[in-house]
Amino acid sequence: FERTRSLQDPCSNCPAGTFCDNNRNQICSPCPPNSFSSAGGQRTCDICRQCKGVFRTRKECSSTSNAECDCTPGFHCLGAGCSMCEQDCKQGQELTKKGCKDCCFGTFNDQKRGICRPWTNCSLDGKSVLVNGTKERDVVCGPSPADLSPGASSVTPPAPAREPGHSPQ
């Protein structure tokens, strides 16, 4: 079938990185600068994605593959194919329409993006607060008071954060 197809359509012989040039008796011509073809048999090459301004080139365009963008420092990608760059905040903050704001008491954010989340409520797991939470860090839950009775081991792994909630201080 491939041989039959190539006899009927000379363009099918053009590899990735080229296009079938109708203006030159359908010979395979290299993609012009700033364009690419990622598959064979193309009649045109596609224009490369241009990473301009706040978009930064993560991967250069080649004759066979498109450029890829990310965001300049201080921003992070959002959306399909990094179609948007969102402002970073510091840990302990969240992004609002008016810019970066500190997390409210009882909430934290340990990343430069995303929203402030409530501290883990240790008591929901029958645990106690081993380390208090901050704007940047969740509380660390420790053993329940009952576990600390004489003869009981005081070294137990912290319970995994489950249902968020305010932790008593």
Partner: antibody, heavy 123, light 107 residues
């Protein structure tokens, strides 16, 4: 509140030059991620991107106009400029400046526009 | 340059109608597409960016969809203030380009 105010339009002779200003308020032209563009619209026609300038000072131009256009800015005045040379009748248009991006998410879309200034090229 | 072709060029509709405007790119542009509304004598107003993100303050009756080469702006229930011209714009590569516009008129 973000505001952009264009000025400098009017009647210009063919072959002459124009220098338009865009005074920005409510944000700084030098803030990271901020871009401001010039976009024009001929009477009864669609929109045409002329070019833009970023907080870094990097400029990008429409190749169809690149040989005749310069975009610059004065950070101390928070003002953007468009210089267009060798004017012809087809440069007659309303010229807008527009800020790229939204409030906290940025990209090449224009959420804030000036009111526009009309440039008429005629003898 | 990347060409954007809008259809229809104009349409007549009544208040309350569902209106759909399409924008077709000359090649794939992923989700790098925006929509604007313009009224006579006024500057354009951003409605949708990155194909489907509603700009702050824009009524939820406006929505955008699509990726690759085919994009749609939908007004779910046309209001009197929506009669205007609508433009798509790509930011996949420079020069940034706009569609030729779709005029929405009162039937």
């Amino acid at each position: 509140e973000v505001q952009l105010v264009e000025s400098g339009g009017g009647l210009v002779q063919p072959g002459g030059s124009l220098r338009l200003s865009c005074a920005a308020s409510g944000f700084s032209l030098s803030t990271s991620g901020v871009a401001v563009a010039w976009i024009r619209q001929a009477p009864g026609k669609g929109l045409e991107w002329i070019g833009d300038i970023y907080h870094s000072g990097n400029t990008y131009y429409n190749p169809s106009l690149k040989s005749r256009v310069t975009i610059s800015r004065d950070n101390s005045k928070n003002t953007l400029y468009l210089q267009l040379n060798s004017l012809r009748a087809e440069d007659t248009a309303v010229y807008y400046c527009a800020r790229g991006g939204s409030d906290t998410v940025v990209g090449d879309w224009f959420a804030y526009w000036g009111q526009g200034t009309l440039v008429t090229v005629s003898s | 340059d990347i060409q954007l072709t809008q259809s229809p060029s104009s349409l007549s509709a009544s208040v309350g109608d569902r209106v759909t405007i399409t924008c077709r790119a000359s090649q794939s542009i992923s989700s790098y597409l925006n929509w604007y509304q313009q009224k006579p004598g006024k500057a354009p107003k951003l409605l949708i960016y990155a194909a489907s993100t509603l700009q702050s303050g824009v009524p939820s009756r406006f929505s955008g969809s699509g990726s690759g080469t085919d994009f749609t702006l939908t007004i779910s229930s046309l209001q009197p203030e929506d009669f205007a011209t609508y433009y798509c714009q790509q930011y996949y590569s420079t020069p940034l380009t706009f569609g030729q516009g779709t005029k929405v008129e009162i039937k």
